[in-house]
């Protein structure tokens, strides 16, 4: 905002060239200039403190008039150079200058540490035009100073492409020590040395540090900030903080807990997410990590069958995501499962064991000794086989699936038959004469269809042929099945 005062000293809220926005404050002019017919010296207007106009930043603009009249030198008046105040207090400082009207065009702006304070709502410019001279006071106020307001403030006046700069006003905001580094919570190995750091700043300086462990001071004599405390080792958890002292008082840091690393607690809530014939997906809730991150986990699996040899399968996995799919299990089997996890200190105990079962699977082997022969009188093909070993059925046998393929003169046709679990033979009708019939058989459980046996082929002649020998699956180790006629 700007305040303009004329002869009658009536203040008006106005806007300074460089500052957008305005802040209404007390606009009472600090001085109302008397009329002056001639140019009056700058000393007539000294709102801050009496003093000569300084010559450090005098501007003597180069431009001269048609008659070569030089413009007189201009300078800001001296003002207070250093302001020390406590945090949250208010401050107001200003720079002032008397500008002969012959300059005709000026702007004034505030700068802090080399950067223009644009949009500074706490800047007020008051000016007092007279016939010959305009007195200008640029005030800057901060209602509640913070540390970030520390710095060097100057006024700049731009006039005829020249810049006039005021002496700097140094603002020093003093307060209680301010932590720039506080001790951090740590997890440490038992009886192992570690360091804690504490740093605080003023102003005012110096700042002295005292360390506190579990409410008791550690050091009798304060250390100058920054301070590093070396703790030789702990056997149990402790709380540390630091006190920072300066002439304004003391500030206490946050208290930080130093924990002793230990082995983790066992996982809890081991649960079955999904079971298949040969795998079980489990999840678990990790126990307390013992102040040290989990590295990995171990899944222990043993058969629950009392007749088993009691061997334990161990599966190692990463600690995350608390899920593991146990594979290579037998179908229709019962297992006990436990989980243990480790950190850098060691392994946790095993979780409570849980029971889990795999589901039925499809048989893993095909029926054995498949034989096929033609019964011409009934125009049927007879098929016989032996059922697969019980252990390899992977479930309760519910039957068999027979595939028979008929091939004749480039035409091929596959048919499927289902047979109940009790039989070990089947009869199928001849579909085509003068054709080859290829037979394969698979065992079936509720878990699915097992692998098909090796194909057995038999030739079905045209009507009127006599005597046919059976065709069969060769015994293990023999060559491919052959058709015997």
């Amino acid at each position: 905002a700007i305040t303009e005062a004329r002869e009658e000293a009536k203040p008006y809220p106005l806007f300074p060239g460089p500052f957008p926005g305005s802040l209404q404050t007390d606009h009472t002019p600090l001085l109302s200039l008397p009329h002056a017919s001639g140019y009056q010296p700058a000393l007539m207007f000294s709102p801050t403190q009496p003093g000569r106009p300084h010559t450090g930043n005098v501007a003597i603009p180069q431009v001269t008039s048609v008659e070569s009249k030089p413009l007189p030198p201009l300078a800001f008046k001296h003002t207070v150079g250093h302001i020390i105040l406590s945090e949250h207090k208010g401050v107001k400082f200003n720079c002032s200058i008397s500008v002969p009207n012959i300059y005709q065009d000026t702007t004034i702006s505030w700068w802090k540490d080399g950067k223009e304070l644009l949009g500074a709502h706490h800047a007020i410019t008051q000016f007092y035009p007279d016939d010959e001279v305009t007195a200008i006071i640029a005030s800057f106020s901060i209602t509640s100073v913070q540390r970030s307001d520390n710095g060097s403030y100057i006024c700049k006046m731009k006039i005829n492409n020249e810049e006039i700069v005021s002496d700097p006003i140094y603002i020093e905001v003093q307060g209680l020590p301010h932590f720039t580094k506080q001790p951090e919570s740590m997890n440490v190995t038992r009886n192992t040395a570690f360091n804690l750091t504490c740093q605080a700043v003023g102003p005012p300086e110096p700042v002295n540090i005292f360390w506190v462990q579990n409410s008791s001071r550690v050091n009798e004599q304060p250390e100058k900030s920054p301070s590093v405390l070396t703790v030789p080792g702990l056997t149990e958890m402790a709380v540390f903080s630091c006190e920072a002292h300066n002439d304004k008082g003391l500030t206490v840091s946050k208290g930080v807990q130093i924990n002793i690393k230990a082995i983790p607690s066992p996982p809890t809530e081991v649960s079955i997410r999904n079971s298949t014939a040969h795998s079980i997906l489990i999840s678990w809730v990790p126990g307390f990590d013992g102040y040290s991150p989990f590295r990995n986990c171990s899944i222990q699996v043993k058969e629950a069958d009392p007749l088993s040899n009691g061997s334990v399968m161990i599966f190692n996995t990463s600690a995350l995501p608390h899920l593991y799919q146990i594979k290579q299990l037998q179908a229709l089997a019962n297992y006990s499962i436990g989980v243990s996890c480790m950190n850098e200190i060691g392994w946790s105990a095993v979780s409570p064991w849980i029971l889990a079962s795999t589901t039925e699977g499809a048989p893993s082997v095909a029926p054995l000794n498949v034989t096929v022969f033609l019964n011409e009188s009934s125009d049927n093909v007879d098929i016989r086989w032996m059922k697969p070993p019980t252990k390899q059925q992977d479930g309760e046998l519910v039957g068999y699936r027979i595939s028979h393929v008929w091939q004749s003169a480039g035409i091929s046709k596959e048919l499927l038959e289902e047979v109940g679990q009790n039989g070990s033979r089947a009869r199928i009708s001849v579909q085509v004469h003068n054709a080859t019939c290829t037979v394969r058989i698979a065992a079936v459980t509720r878990g699915g269809v097992g692998p098909f046996s090796d194909p057995v082929k038999i030739f079905i002649p045209a009507h009127g042929w006599v005597d046919y020998a059976p065709s069969s699956t060769p015994a293990p180790g023999n060559a491919d099945p052959v058709l015997i006629i």
């Epitope: 303009e4 431009v63 009249k69 005709q104 949009g119 010959e132």
Partner: antibody, heavy 120, light 107 residues
Framework: QIQLVQSGPELKKPGETVKISCKAS????????MNWVKQAPGKGLKWMGW????????TYADDFKGRFVFSLETSASTAYLQINNLKNEDMATYFC?????????????WGAGTTVTVSS | DIVLTQSHKFMSTSVGDRVSITCKAS??????VTWCQQKPGQPPKLLIY???TRHTGVPDRFTGSGSGTDFTLTINNVQSEDLADYFC?????????FGAGTKLELK
Amino acid sequence: QIQLVQSGPELKKPGETVKISCKASGYTFTNYGMNWVKQAPGKGLKWMGWINTYTGEPTYADDFKGRFVFSLETSASTAYLQINNLKNEDMATYFCARKSTVVSRYFDVWGAGTTVTVSS
Amino acid sequence: DIVLTQSHKFMSTSVGDRVSITCKASQDVGDAVTWCQQKPGQPPKLLIYWASTRHTGVPDRFTGSGSGTDFTLTINNVQSEDLADYFCQQYRSYPLTFGAGTKLELK
């Protein structure tokens, strides 16, 4: 009483030159900058620039650089606007206006205006 | 350049009415705005400067307000002699610019 008195209307042909005067009275001429403002018929106001009446240094707005010249006769408290090589689009009323103070760029006193007619 | 927009080219009013003329700046100009009145064949006449300060001799029925980018000239109890063109002008930065004007006429 503060006054700005401008010269009378001008009728010119394209390509000619015109020089308009603005005589100040009632204040110290060299203490206040003088601005020039153009108003074409039925149009708004357009700032042309200003001249420092103490140093004689002119400042021209971008649209008025080249054919337009601000000058002074300080002893006569008079500011001049000269337009060279007149064009049809220069037909307008031209006002001089006093800059109010060192730190304010508004115009507190205006001349009555000089009408320039450009016709072949 | 800073552009000043006076959204109403014409405004109709009656004697005794209250009327508000607006001016919008394309960027923040603080309160470095004036309002001028111009009657046909006459030069502009300064009414308001620094957005809200009345110039010497201007009747108090003329009031200026606003800061930043939005400004208003309010005329209370409009008189017949107030029928004229009204211009806003910014002097926050060079080049100085004017609004296109608002013509106040009788209904």
